[in-house]
Structures are given as C-alpha cells and as structure tokens.
C-alpha cells in the first residue's frame, strides 16, 4: 500500500464522565476528497475495531447511530471523541486513515493514543 503519515497524541486522559477526545492528523500526499477513518483498540496484543466513518470533504463526519464515537473534520485533521468509557477500556487507541477517493488509495496508521480511564469514586453518603 502507498503509505501515509498519521499523527495522534501519545496520551489522553478521559474525563470523569468517560469521554476522551483526540486529534488524528494525516499528511495527504494527494488531493483527498473521500476519507475513511477507523479507530482501533489494541489491548493485550489484540486489536478490535471501535468505530469507523467515511466522509466526503466538506461533509460532516457521521458514525453509525449506535457508535460510541463522534467526530468532526477540518482539512487534514479529524477530531475524534469516544464516549461511554470505563476503566476497563483503558488501552491504546489507534487511528487508521484511508484515502478512498480519488485514486490512488493510500493507507496511514498512527502510533496510537494511550487513553487512560479512571472510574469515578462513588459519592459518599451525606448526612443532612
């Protein structure tokens, strides 16, 4: 495959509500007009697909209705948000970018963003 550089932050800490956001940036070698973005999770040497979306430049980035991901695109950057995360979801989240159209096809895979998720402490009972 024709390789493409993809950059993403090394570490992100999820919010107390289990939401993590990060930017996935790709160095487009050509004039990309349709892009597919896939988020992969790597844990214990197993890789699973978290979510994926294909978008046309100038159009909104739409994931499936039941997806835990949302996102927006701007130029060669995709702002990804993953929600509903719990401590057990801590892991390496890899951004995979494919330039689908026009040809030629390009593929880029980032080094991954380590997302740390800490479950909030339950609120202590208050005496009022």
């Amino acid at each position: 495959c024709k390789a493409m550089h993809v950059a993403q932050p090394a570490v992100v800490l999820a919010s107390s509500r289990g939401i993590a956001s990060f930017v996935c940036e790709y160095a487009s070698p050509g004039k990309a007009t349709e892009v597919r973005v896939t988020v992969l999770r790597q844990a214990d040497s197993q890789v699973t697909e978290v979510c994926a979306a294909t978008y046309m430049m100038g159009n909104e980035l739409t994931f499936l209705d039941d997806s835990i991901c949302t996102g927006t695109s701007s130029g060669n950057q995709v702002n990804l948000t993953i929600q509903g995360l719990r401590a057990m979801d801590t892991g390496l989240y890899i951004c995979k970018v494919e330039l689908m159209y026009p040809p030629p096809y390009y593929l880029g895979i980032g080094n991954g963003t380590q997302i740390y998720v800490i479950d909030p402490e339950p609120c202590p009972d208050s005496d009022f």
Epitope: C1, M56, M57, N59, Y101, P102, P103
Partner: antibody
Framework: EVQLRQSGPELVKPGTSVKISCKAS????????INWVKQNHGKSLEWIGD????????NSNQKFEGKATLTVDKSSSTAYMELRSLTSEDSAVYYC?????????????WGQGTSVTVSS | DIVMTQAAFSNPVTLGTSASISCRSS???????????LYWYLQKPGQSPQLLIY???NLASGVPDRFSSSGSGTDFTLRISRVEAEDVGVYYC?????????FGAGTKLELK
Amino acid sequence: EVQLRQSGPELVKPGTSVKISCKASGYKFTDHFINWVKQNHGKSLEWIGDINPNNGGTNSNQKFEGKATLTVDKSSSTAYMELRSLTSEDSAVYYCARLRREYFYAMDYWGQGTSVTVSS
Amino acid sequence: DIVMTQAAFSNPVTLGTSASISCRSSKSLLHSNGITYLYWYLQKPGQSPQLLIYQMSNLASGVPDRFSSSGSGTDFTLRISRVEAEDVGVYYCAQNLELPLTFGAGTKLELK
C-alpha cells in the same frame, strides 16, 4: 428512484462556449461525487473529471484542463459542465454519472447524455 | 495513463450459448490492499452505459448472474453464460486504480 436528467442537445458555433446541466433526484445530492464522461459519436468513453457536491472540489483529466469547468448548485441538486473555445473535436455526447462508494467508486447511475455539435 | 485494450468485436455468438470478452491493462490493477480496480460497463444501442461489474468480479445490483468476471492483475475476462438478445451492445472495461480514470475502446457483442 435515482435519476440524473441532463439538458437537451446543443448546436453551437466554433470558438463559443456551452454549459450543460445534470439534475439529480432520488438521493441525497451531497452524498455522491458526480463524474463527467465524453463519448465521441459511436466511439469510446473518456473521463473528463469529477466534482464533490459539498465543496465544489474537483479532480480532472489533464487532457480537459482549460476546456471543461465543473460546478454544482447544491440548492437545486444540479451539476454543470461548461466547455469553452469549442472546436469540431468537442462534438460528442457528454454524460454525467454518479459515483457509488459501495461499488468502490464505480459509476452506478448515468444521465441520458447531452449531444453537443460544434458547427459553423 | 493506464491503457485499457479490448478487441473491437467479439466472436459472433448464438442465443443461449456462452460468450467471453477480454480486456488487458497496461499496468496491474491489483492493489496491495487486495482490491482489483477493474470495472465492466455495458452500453446497449441508443442507451447510456450501465454498470455491470465492480472490483473485477462483483455484480452490481440488478445484474443477472449469467454475468461473471475474472482475471489476473492485467488480463481480464467477462463471461456471459447464456446470451440473451438484451445482452447485445458494447462492453467497456475501465480502471480506477489511478487518475485519470480510463476505459477500453469497447467490444461489440454480436449475434450469429
């Protein structure tokens, strides 16, 4: 039902320009690229270029740069191609066609074609 | 540009028999992603072209399974198992491995 309806035949003089239209219906216009293809009468097909209806971004065949200009009007779900400095070599049938990502960007629906005849 | 080469005419075929149409590309259309960027279109007399096959061997919606396609990276064959009168027309192979998209000159299917 998906349809691409093209404007009618054109008889134009050498050196002039012509603008042909392709009105889309039956699907969300901004979800698919529109391609333009030239067919010299009874001959093969030549790809002219494509346009992204969202932002008007185009990809084109170098052979047609300076000859064809592709535009869209999102409000009317219509794609346009303007051909300028016409010569007899431009006499042909021109098709618009929709690209479908599920078919790996094949042209799955075509307009009925617009015949352009350049003659003095 | 990638050149797609086709014979102008097929061998005349009898209704109900099989027909083969060949196409050759000047460069392999098999990408390292495993996809072969080869397409077949049919233009019936007086009509616009219509998509038959995408990604070398996949039938587009509504295309009868009498049609099939196979090939290597550069040599491709479209087969029609039982030719019907409505199959008459010009068959074009095309590539979209790279820009510009290119078509073959077309092969006319003729009946005996």
